[in-house]
Every structure is written in C-alpha cells, then in structure tokens.
C-alpha cells in the first residue's frame, strides 16, 4: 500500500506496511532550485521555506496565461518527493526553495548561477548543518555552470542534479556533466530506464546512479491535498537528494566523496536492462539504482571504491584520455579500454599534485578510455613504481618495495603499436602477489599504498579458450581496487571494474583462433582495511 | 564526469586590435576564450557571463565591468551590467551586443566569456 518508488529505495529491514525509516533527514537543509511552489500544500506545509530569490525569464508567447497551479507544478511535486509528509523520502528534512524556472519550466544559466551564489552567501552568513542542493534542471554543456557547481561542492555543499530527459549522453548537458555534482538518471517500477515520449533518461559516464523516476506520486499544486504522478530525471534526482539528506542526518560529518561512495555502495546493482542504452554507452553507464543504507551507522569500516571513466580520447594517433578521482579520493589503480583493441595501455601520472589515470590511443585505433579506480582510504600514502621495458624474455616486473606498502593496482603502457601480436602470454610467477608483470616492451606501473591496516591480495581467473569477457570478483568483505588483464593476450580490448568485479573484454571470439593466443586471464586486486573495521567497532 | 570535456562550442577570438593597444591586453601568454551552447535553439545571444580569473576581487570585477561599459560607449554601444558575481565565481553578467565580444575578451582579468543559454525543468 505504499508507493512503489518508496518501497524500491527502502531496504527490506524497514519494509513494513509503512515507509518509516529512522531519522528523516532532520539535521539537513535541502535547497531546491526550480519553479515556484505551493508551500501550503499538506505534504510540505511548514517544511519548505520559500526564499525571496527569483530570477526567471519571461514566458514565451504573447497569449501565455499564468495559472498559479501550473506555475507551481514541478517544484511542488519535487519538494513533496524530497520531504513530503506522506509520500516523501526524507520526511524530516527542511527545504528552502529558489525560483529559477518560470511557469513554462524554463530558466537561464545566468539565473541558476545567481541562485547558486545566493546559496553560498546564505551559507556564509548563517552556517547551518549539512546542505544539499537539488538542481532538477538541465541545459546544454556550460563551462560556467559546471565551474560554479564545482566551487559550491568544494565549499562542502552536496549538489544533486537530474541527468536530463533527452535520451542522450548526460555529458552533453549541464549541470549533469559537472564532476562534483551527483548526477541521477531515471528508472521505472521494473528497474528499466525511463522512456519519456520519444526521449527518455540520459545515460553515460556522467551519470552517477539511477533512481525511481516514472509514475512518482507526489504533491500536486492543483489543490492543497491533491497528489499527482509525474515522471522524469528530476523526480529521480529528488529521491537521491532525499536519501542524501537521510545519510547526512545520520552522519553529518560525511564529505561529498564519502556520500557519493556510500550512495553507490548501497545501490541495487545490475538490475537495469542495459539493452535500452546505445551500445557504445552501455559499458560507461552505471548499472545502479539508489537505495537507503540498511542501517544508518556502521558503514565506516568498509573500504569504498568506485569506477570513473574518462571522456573518449578521440581517434588521433597520439590521443590520450584522462580519468580523475575526486579531491578526497585516492587513485588506487588505472586501466584502459578500446573498442577496436588498438591502444597503447595506460599509466598513472602526477598532475597538479594528484595522481591521474591516462590511457593512450594507438595508430589506427578509434580511441581509448581511461578507467580510474577511486577509493576512500584515510591516511593513505600512495605512490607509483615504474619499471621501464625489460630486455629479458621473462618480461617487465615491478613490485612494492617500500616497507608496509601493498600493491593496489597494475598498469602497463607501451610505445610499439602492435605489442604482443605474435608473442605467447607471460605468466605471473606464483607466490609473488605484490608484483606487477608485463611485456618486455612495456613499462609497468605499480600502485603502492600504505594505509593503517590495509591488506590486499591478488585473485586471477583464466579461461583457456577464447572468450569475449572474463570476470573475477572479490569476495565478501574485500573491495576491488585493481583490475587488469594478464599480459600477452593481444586481442584484449581492455579491463575495467564494475562494482566488485574485474571485467576483461576481448575481441569478438569469432575473429580469434583457439590457440594459446586466445587464453584470457583477468587479474583482480582485492583489498580491505582492518583499521577501518576496528575504528568502526570502537564506535559501536 | 570531466569538466573540460563537453560538446560545447568554443570560439577563440583573435586578440589583435590596433584600436585598444597593449595596455588593454590580458596578462601575457593567456587567451580568454568564448563559449556558447552547442544547442542553437537554447542560446540567448545578447547576454553574457564574463568570468574573471580565480583570485579576482569584487572591486576588480566591478572595475572591469565599468571599463567594458566605458569602452563600449566610446564605440557607440549601450551595455547593461545585470549582476556582479562574487562568492562563487568572480565576474559579471552583461547585456550587450555580440559585436563587443572581441573587446570584452581583451579586458584584464578575463578568463572566459560564456553566452547565456536556457535551462529546463526535467
């Protein structure tokens, strides 16, 4: 008897006949930048403060008739989804609304910028608890809007935005494309991507996760007790803003990086039918549907990691692609992927005092992606150890030689265009888990980290026959930090992490002979932090 | 999500102009860029966000805005400063003719200029 969307985001332990998870986000203030709202609606009365901020363009058309209930429709519904008494996610959260969209749901980048500035000034004048800013809007890619979002995020504000309803790559829109913003796509009751007329939810690497966004029951501005069903990535973003408010209310000290990692960690995995997305976007789009954590505390022991894909490098011979982690995250490994299989590997390198993951295209290649594994590892000291190409037939090796440092990832990068085409695979010597092994023509990069209580192990899964995909997963309690293919298999397109599974992709098996050249081995590095586990036990 | 990778249109305008001389040129070695929305129907020409370099103070932003107005007036153009940004990004919002972009890009402290564009409820 509860709306499907509230049931979907609620972990089974809370699922009674009613939706009443502990603590409704009461320590958090959620700012909504949208249309005007009907603040005396039963769902949100006394919960939403309408600020005096208004920056909207004139409505289009000479015969436009301003009808209050229509002007308030979008914003009222979203305020209800976030904090509504009866159909809201974070029933205890208080909200503030800023009007940046007119009665036709249209606004400007400049108006949105001024709104974000207003929030920052309010925060400085009267610092409160954690702030969440919901941006249920989208425009074309905007450097300035993304920059403003970045600044606000670095001031400690959590920004949540709609991925967009254009059935397109979310990276082409703002603020969806801003890395610091939590970008949300929409799914329906069947956990499928939402179709909206001829369009639908946006997708791609700029989407962080999906959330319920079709037939969402919420406050209707038609009357003070009315409800209506609405659909869109705005509704999905409102769910995540509500979940974020709940999480921050339970743990007010959470940073943006920690919150994002938890949102990803507690999401339902691999439930979306990826066939809905364009083929080239499937690998880039996260198969995650947001959910509340099963308990508000005790997640701290976990080593959280996420996968960050770069933009496509483009096809030029020397093209590179760079994937970056957030400021509070550690880059624990770096891999690369190319649909054509023509790539020159990847390397971790310092840029502006921080490690980044850079992938290199090869001659004749259609371009590459760099894939960073970004983790939360407090008090970590990580460095990259590089071994230049070796002359020995055994291949290139590098290990973590510093005391207390453990291997979290391996990368290899080569200058020659057709590395390993006619060479047998190089096998990793057993009993040397702290070591990266690669082609003798390749330089090998080991990511070595020291952090209290950090322990890692290598897990391999090899398939002798040609296979389009080989996977290896870390077991319960361990987190995947590194993912690579055992060198020597020239038809490998690349390796990347999906949640806790290392995926190694190869060319279509029909084009590969069944010689030893067809053998594929996926190598996962799985880590855990005893220190985080102990700290968590001490808290409880 | 990469800030610098987006399918937006970037026009780098040449900064050679005898009229303004070197005194008006931005700090050497840097080229201010102009950006606009790749989706044509969403563009709002005539309104521009002038973004200044990161450490620019409010007083410098106001001075730069006034300077743009004065130089535009000398050329017979009317401009209106709609808002001066500070707190998040230094800069200002200006209503002006697109003819003045080349001039605006040469102003001191200018990092880039973006033409205003529409956003929509999703």
């Amino acid at each position: 008897s509860i709306p499907w969307n509230l049931e979907r985001i609620t972990p089974p332990r809370y699922r009674a006949d009613e939706y009443q998870p502990p603590d409704g986000g009461s320590l958090v203030e959620v700012y909504l930048l949208d249309t005007s709202i009907q603040s005396d609606h039963r769902e949100i009365e006394g919960r939403v403060m309408v600020t005096d901020f208004e920056n909207v363009p004139e409505e289009d058309g000479t015969r436009f008739h301003r009808q209050a209930s229509k002007c308030d429709s979008h914003g009222t519904h979203l305020a209800g989804v976030v904090s509504g008494r009866d159909a809201g996610v974070a029933k205890g959260a208080s909200m503030r609304s800023l009007r940046v969209l007119n009665c036709q749901g249209k606004g400007t980048v400049s108006g949105t910028l001024i709104g974000l500035e207003f929030i920052r000034k309010s925060q400085l004048v009267q610092p409160v608890g954690p702030l969440v800013v919901l941006l249920p809007l989208a425009g074309g890619y905007s450097r300035v809007l993304n920059a403003a979002c970045q600044r606000l995020a670095r001031a400690g504000v959590v920004l949540v935005t709609a991925a967009g309803n254009f059935r397109d790559d979310a990276c082409l829109y703002s603020p969806a494309s801003a890395p610091e913003v939590i970008t949300v796509g929409a799914t329906n009751a069947q956990d499928q991507p939402v179709t909206l007329g001829t369009l639908g939810t946006n997708f791609g690497r700029c989407v962080d996760l999906f959330a319920p966004g079709e037939d969402i029951i919420g406050a209707s501005s038609d009357c003070s007790t009315c409800f209506v069903s609405q659909s869109g990535t705005s509704q999905a973003a409102a769910h995540v803003a509500g979940i974020a408010a709940m999480m921050l209310s339970a743990e007010p000290e959470l940073t943006l990086a920690e919150l994002r990692q938890r949102l990803i960690h507690f999401s339902a995995k691999d439930v979306i039918n990826e066939a809905w997305f364009p083929e080239d976007q499937r690998v880039l789009t996260p198969n995650l549907v947001a959910a509340l954590p099963p308990s508000t505390h005790g997640a701290g022991w976990q080593l959280f990691c996420r996968t960050v894909w770069s933009a496509h490098s483009g096809p030029t011979r020397m093209a590179t692609a760079v994937a970056r982690c957030a400021p509070d995250e550690e880059l624990l490994s770096c891999s690369s992927f190319s649909r054509s299989g023509k790539r020159r590997g990847e390397r971790m390198e310092a840029q502006g005092g921080k490690l980044v993951c850079r992938a290199h295209n090869a001659f004749g290649g259609e371009g590459v992606y760099a894939i960073a594994r970004c983790c939360l590892l407090p008090q970590a000291n990580c460095s990259v150890h590089t071994a230049p190409p070796a002359e020995a037939s055994m291949g290139t090796r590098v290990h973590c030689h510093q005391q207390g440092h453990v291997l979290t990832g391996c990368s290899s990068h080569w200058e020659v265009e057709d590395l390993g085409t006619h060479k047998p695979p190089v096998l990793r010597p057993r009993g040397q888990p702290n070591q990266c092994v690669g082609h003798r023509e390749a330089s090998i990069h080991a990511s070595c980290c020291h952090a209290p209580g950090l322990e890692c192990k290598v897990k391999e899964h090899g398939i002798p026959a040609p296979q389009e995909q080989v996977t290896v997963a870390c077991e319960e309690g361990w987190t995947l930090t590194g993912c690579s293919a055992l060198p020597g298999t020239s038809h490998v397109l690349g390796a990347y992490a999906v949640d806790n599974t290392c995926v190694v992709r190869s060319r279509d098996v029909s084009t590969t002979g069944s010689t030893s050249e067809g053998a594929v081995t996926a190598v996962a590095i799985c880590c855990r932090s005893r220190h985080l586990a102990q700290a968590s036990q001490e808290l409880q | 999500q990469e800030d610098e990778d987006g399918d937006y249109e970037e026009l780098v305008l040449a900064l050679r102009s005898e009229e303004d001389g070197l005194a008006e040129a931005p700090e050497h070695g840097t080229t201010a860029t102009f950006h606009r929305c790749a989706k044509d129907p969403w563009r709002l020409p005539g309104t521009y966000v002038v973004v200044l370099k990161e450490e620019t103070h409010l007083s410098q932003s106001e001075r730069t805005a006034r300077r743009l107005q004065a130089q535009a007036a000398r050329r017979g153009y009317l401009t209106k400063i709609l808002h001066v940004f500070h707190g998040l990004l230094p800069g200002f919002l200006v209503k002006m003719s697109g003819d003045l972009l080349e001039l605006a890009l040469k102003l001191p402290h200018v990092d880039y200029i973006e033409e205003d564009s529409s956003v929509f409820a999703q």
Epitope: S1, I2, D40, R85, D86, I217, C223, T225, F227 | -
Partner: antibody, heavy 126, light 106 residues
C-alpha cells in the same frame, strides 16, 4: 464496512481542554490510503474542518484553530484523538470524526470526507 | 481562506419538483468541490465529489456541475427523503464548507 464512533465528555468547563476519541472499526487506521479528520458543527450552524492526521502521525490543522488543536493517533488501538485547549462557549458544537482519502494511493477513492461518525455534542459551560 | 456562499438559504419545493442549489467560491477552486446531504440528527453524507462525480450508492437524480467559482447541485425530481440541508465543500485550499441550503417541503 467501515464505521467511526466518537467518544468523550459531553460537558467541558471554559478554559479547560476538550478531549475526544474516535474509534475506527471494520478497517485499519494504519492504511497509507487515508487521513482521519475532525469536523465540528455549532448548533444550527454550518460545518468547520478542525484538522486531520495520517497513520504516521503527520498532522495538518485549520489555520484558525492551529494554536489550540492537537490530533494524535494510536494505531495499536485503531483510534485517533482530538484535544482542543482553552475552550470557550463558542466551541460548543457537535464534533464529528471522518475518513479522508490521502491521495497517496489514488485507487483508494475520492479525496473527500466519507464516511463520518454519528457525532457527539460537546457543551462548554461552567 | 476560500469562502463558499450557498444560495438560496432555504428552498421550498414539492416532491417531484426539480431543485437547483448554487454554491459560489470567493476564488477559483477548479473542480475541487463536493456536496453533502445532512438530515436532522445525522452526520453529513457525501453525494457529489470533484464537482460532478456521484459518490457510491447515490441515486442518479443527484447531479453536480460547474468549475472555477460557480457550482450547481441539481435534484431532478425530489423524493420525500431528499428534504434535508445540503452543504458544499472545497479542497482547493485546505477545507471550507458553505453555509448550507435547506430544502424543505412546500
């Protein structure tokens, strides 16, 4: 078939607090489909909505009475209650309880008061 | 607050006649208006909701019309049990009731 029954003292002294309880039978008060409301009718006059409550405890009140009204719910007893403080003779009325569809579950029916209890007369007098 | 004004205050008609009751709102209530019937010593009973929809078990002789600010309840042919007081109620903005129209036997 759902029935509502009001109960409570028929006489209250001025400045005291009026307390009434509505017992719901033939259905659960814990359904997310409904709100439960109080309406009153002074003798020979029209109807006035006082306030409503949801099973979760969320309430909303008539702005003109808000400062004096408290509505609470006890799902274990399938009851909801009304407290009206600082009463005067003007609060003398027949007090009704009624069910109202919340609108959260659209299939539950129209968003109006139906059914009603039979009402209880409360007189404010010293 | 939205004020509902009902007219006439009293309507004197004979059984079999047509009754037309009016309810006017001080501002638009869209179609968020209901009609209730109340007999002496009884609780009100929902007749019409959302301006024109008959509630369950209500005879077809009762019909509602109107939207915005002007609404009408029509009883096509009065039966003896229809003589009662009729109230309109809006829910566009919270809940308010009209003052009532008494339909009495002529």
């Amino acid at each position: 078939q759902l029935q509502l029954q009001e109960s409570g003292p028929g006489l209250v002294k001025p400045s005291e607090t009026l307390s009434l309880t509505c017992t719901v039978s033939g259905g659960s008060i814990s359904s997310s489909s409904y709100y439960w409301g109080w309406i009153r009718q002074p003798p020979g006059k029209g109807l006035e909505w006082i306030g409503s409550i949801y099973y979760s405890g969320s309430t909303y009140y008539n702005p003109s009475l808000k400062s004096r009204v408290t509505i609470s719910v006890d799902t274990s007893k399938n009851q909801f209650s009304l407290k009206l403080s600082s009463v005067t003779a003007a609060d003398t009325a027949v007090y009704y309880c009624a069910r109202e569809n919340s609108g959260v579950v659209p299939a539950a029916g129209p968003n109006w008061f139906d059914p009603w209890g039979q009402g209880t007369l409360v007189t404010v007098s010293s | 607050e939205i004020v509902l004004t009902q007219s006439p205050a009293t309507l004197s008609l004979s059984p079999g006649e047509r009754a037309t009751l009016s309810c006017r709102a001080s501002q638009s209530v869209s179609s968020y208006l209901a009609w209730y019937q109340q007999k002496p010593g009884q609780a009100p009973r929902l007749l019409i909701y959302d301006a024109s929809n008959r509630a369950t078990g209500i005879p077809a002789r009762f019909s509602g019309s109107g939207s915005g600010t002007d609404f009408t309840l029509t009883i096509s042919s009065l039966e003896p049990e229809d003589f009662a007081v009729y109230y309109c109620q809006q829910r566009r903005n919270w809940f308010t009731f009209g003052g009532g129209t008494k339909v009495e036997i002529k």
